[in-house]
């Protein structure tokens, strides 16, 4: 197979014909050294998936349900290109499956039993698979056949295409369950009409259905969406209140050696030459031979799926949960309102050891999952492999953009017993230099810098945000002569000062000796000119408070703070000499797990929190000999957030704005994936 050939998989004679036409037309417009198309014909999409996994083909376009099949082992395929709909300016690659109700009704998602339901059709994504998959474990047993369980759950339904003879209750609201537009309650508009007419109490449709059927806002205001957290929201708020986000139609390829760049190059060129309204001879998004061949006729173009986005992230936790429930038919033995153990995400093996000790002491109420970077941990929480972790504000921002929510804040200054209910203002991000140096905020260019990690608040977002507004470019590695900013590109000058050891050099975890607050300060002590840390770092690591060899003889007076006005002050004066106030670190979780995480952590800190005095012979949650493992070591308690329960409210408008500005310079693959 030529290196630059993309073997497209076709699933019918008509698709194969269109594929050959696609191949011939691409050949006529692309240079001979450019990508080319070859066509492979298989009997079904599942056969195509297997062929790609076996390296007999390279690409095929799939609906969401099949993307799930493609992702499962042993196929292990991943999404590489998405079709988009709507305009180029506002491309839609996903739709949202929603549960619509009338505003004057008074039930929530967990009170659907005994209601009347309207569905788009049996086996369809938004109308059946997603809602029934998510409700699966609430259905009465036996859950097979599924239609019978659903009929016994709702008091009456309209499920077009269901068998009205075997399951009459599923056709109670639309006699015969007609499987075409002859049934007035068929498909999206029909299911909504079923609700509108008062036949049903809830309609399972997609977010756009309401807008397509009710042009008038006043009419739309008579309806609401049911959210998975048992609240309701207006129909405009579908992004924050849906059953699942569903990718529309996606090109998949192998996860390893999948030619994703070549596939993108090919499709990008294809849409330039043969996209909507581009060519008379050949059209990518239509065909005289039939409907939706190779690509959906309604597609307007393609978008490259960010490389960090695997199938789990692309399909989303809710969608995967729904489909897995339906396919595997397994439900937890424990009642769903009971909290299962919380899986904490630990960074690398140092945190994992502490987490393991916590797990033993919690009698298994805490379990541990590991990842090598904070972003990998956030991704694991998103997809359900882990449940929670405590994060610096910069990562609270990324986690928030990825749909996670803050649950509890670390408090550093409030003594018990008021600690748990106190909202602290935050800590100070400071720039520390040696007293012997002549550095000021205004002459840092060309100096050696030490950072906690890329993307963290005191070590990166605040100082680099301030720097960006001064230099107006993102080439921070050119501003400093060298430095250590764990998480930077390995060949960057901002990895030059890092200490490793070797395979872990510049990694954003505790295996890198200069990672985190203590690490950045150590970098200053041993190699650097300036360290960007929290205001407590110098006092916590001087005067014998840190027993490690490099720190045990350090004196606080040998270090000073840089003030933004060009002056310098003692490390005892951070309130009058800091770069900005930083939001405290906070525990994050998925929305569905937030309450359990909060309840469990409040219970755990009563046993293992700062009330434990002897940490040499007892487990202490907030202690790791200055290494800030799992939590900052100076945490007094984890505090309730009250109404600051979204990342925007928790971080505050000013900080969110600063980080949003710095996104121009973002090196976060996860953030790119989450904002796709």
């Amino acid at each position: 197979v030529p290196e630059k050939s993309v073997r497209w998989c076709a699933v019918s004679e008509h698709e194969a014909t269109k594929c050959q036409s696609f191949r011939d037309h691409m050949k006529s417009v692309l240079p001979s050294n450019g990508p080319s198309v070859a066509c492979v014909k298989k009997a079904s999409h599942l056969d195509c998936i297997r062929a790609i996994a076996a390296n007999e083909a390279d690409a095929v376009t799939l609906d969401a349900g099949l993307v799930y099949d493609a992702y499962l082992a042993p196929n292990n395929l991943k999404p590489v290109v998405a079709e988009f709909y709507g305009s180029k300016e506002d491309p839609q690659t996903f739709y949202y499956a929603v549960a619509v109700v009338k505003k004057d009704s008074d039930f929530q998602m967990n009170q659907l039993r005994g209601r009347k339901s309207c569905h788009t059709g049996l086996g369809r994504s938004a109308g059946w698979n997603i809602p029934i998959g998510l409700l699966y474990c609430d259905l009465p047993e036996p859950r097979k056949p599924l239609e019978k369980a659903v009929a016994n759950f709702f008091s009456g339904s309209c499920v077009p295409c269901a068998d009205g003879t075997d399951f009459p209750q599923l056709c109670q609201l639309c006699p015969g369950c007609g499987c075409s537009t002859l049934n007035q309650y068929f498909s999206y508009s029909g299911a909504f009409k079923c609700l509108k007419d008062g036949a049903g109490d809830v309609a399972f449709v997609k977010h756009s259905t309401i807008f397509e059927n009710l042009a008038n806002k006043a009419d739309r205001d008579q309806y609401e969406l049911l959210c998975l957290d048992n609240t309701r929201k207006s129909v405009d708020e579908y992004k924050d209140c849906h059953l699942a986000r569903v990718p529309s139609h996606t090109v998949v390829a192998r996860s390893v050696g999948g030619k994703e760049d070549l596939i993108w190059e090919l499709l990008n060129q294809a849409q330039e030459h043969f996209g909507k309204d581009k060519s008379k001879e050949f059209q990518l998004f239509s065909s005289p031979h039939g409907k939706d061949l190779l690509f959906k006729d309604s597609a307007h173009g393609f978008l490259k799926v960010p490389p960090r986005m695997d199938a789990k992230m692309y399909l989303g936790y809710e969608y995967i949960t729904a489909i897995r429930n339906l396919r595997e038919g397994t439900c937890p033995e424990a009642p769903t309102d009971e909290c299962k153990p919380v899986k904490w995400c630990a960074l690398s093996h140092h945190e994992r050891l502490k987490c393991d000790e916590w797990s033993v002491n919690s009698a298994g109420k805490i379990e541990c999952e590991s990842a090598e970077t904070t972003e990998d941990c956030i991704a694991k929480i998103m997809n359900g492999e882990a449940d929670a972790m405590s994060l610096d504000g910069g990562f609270v921002y990324i986690a928030g953009m990825c749909g996670l929510v803050p649950v509890l804040a670390e408090n550093y200054n409030t003594p018990n017993p008021n600690c748990e209910n106190t909202a602290e203002e935050g800590y100070f991000a400071v720039a520390v230099v040696k007293s012997s140096s002549d550095l000021t905020w205004d002459n840092l260019k060309g100096k050696k810098s030490c950072h906690t990690a890329v993307g963290r608040t005191a070590g990166w977002n605040i100082p680099m945000g301030l720097l960006y507004s001064k230099i107006n470019h993102c080439r921070f590695d050119e501003f400093f002569s060298e430095g250590c900013a764990p998480g930077s590109e390995k060949n960057s000058s901002l990895c030059k000062l890092c200490m490793g050891p070797s395979p872990n050099l510049c990694e954003p975890n505790n295996k890198e000796g200069y990672y985190g607050y203590t690490g950045a300060f150590r970098c200053l002590v041993e190699k650097g000119d300036v360290a960007f840390v929290k205001h407590q770092t110098v006092p916590q690591n001087t005067g014998g408070k840190n027993p490690d060899a490099w720190a045990k003889n350090l004196k606080e007076e040998d270090y000073e703070l840089l003030c933004l006005d060009g002056s310098r002050k003692s490390v005892q004066e951070p309130a009058n000499c800091h770069l900005a106030r930083a939001p405290n670190h906070a525990v994050v979780a998925r929305k569905d797990k937030a309450d359990c995480v909060q309840t469990l952590l409040l219970d755990q800190q009563r046993m293992f929190g700062s009330s434990v005095t002897d940490c040499s012979s007892n487990f202490c949650l907030f202690e790791s000999k200055t290494k800030d493992l799992l939590f900052r070591d100076d945490t007094v308690c984890l505090a309730k957030l009250h109404d600051r329960n979204t990342y925007e409210k928790y971080l505050g408008e000013e900080y969110v704005k600063a980080v949003t500005n710095l996104r121009k310079c973002s090196t976060s693959p996860l953030l790119e994936a989450c904002t796709f």
């Epitope: 002491n361 009698a363 790791s624």
Partner: nanobody
Framework: EVQLVECGGGLVQPGGSLRLSCAAS????????MAWYRQAPGQQRELVAG???????NYADSVKGRFTISRDNAKNTLYLQMNSLKPEDTAVYYC???????????WGQGTQVTVSS
């Protein structure tokens, strides 16, 4: 600082039993948490079982109901009773007491357990 030495490993058939011991060079009475870990070739070291000073225990899902951890403070020894052994239990088994903190990468020699017919 207490030194720990593991022993009791060996070759055993599937379904068989072994009892591992971990002898401490000093008193373990004041040590809060002790644990057994294992590492199979090419795998990460994983927690098998742990026990607190108060006797609270915790097990990895894969060994629940088959392995039992216990400690004898008078003898300064930690034990792991392993029953119904499976080929996937094959690994080097280590004990730890977390007293060196989480940062020192200190592990003893461990004891090899091989489950094979």
């Amino acid at each position: 600082e207490v030194q720990l030495v593991e022993c009791g490993g060996g070759l055993v058939q599937p379904g068989g039993s072994l009892r591992l011991s971990c002898a401490a060079s000093g008193s373990i009475a004041s040590i809060n948490t002790m644990a057994w870990y294992r590492q199979a070739p090419g795998q990460q070291r994983e927690l098998v079982a742990g026990i607190t000073r108060g006797g609270s225990t915790n097990y990895a899902d894969s060994v629940k109901g088959r392995f039992t951890i216990s400690r004898d403070n008078a003898k300064n020894t930690l034990y792991l009773q392993m029953n119904s052994l499976k080929p996937e239990d094959t690994a080097v088994y280590y004990c730890t007491d977390y007293s060196r903190g989480y940062y020192q990468d200190y592990w003893g020699q461990g004891t090899q357990v091989t489950v094979s017919s």
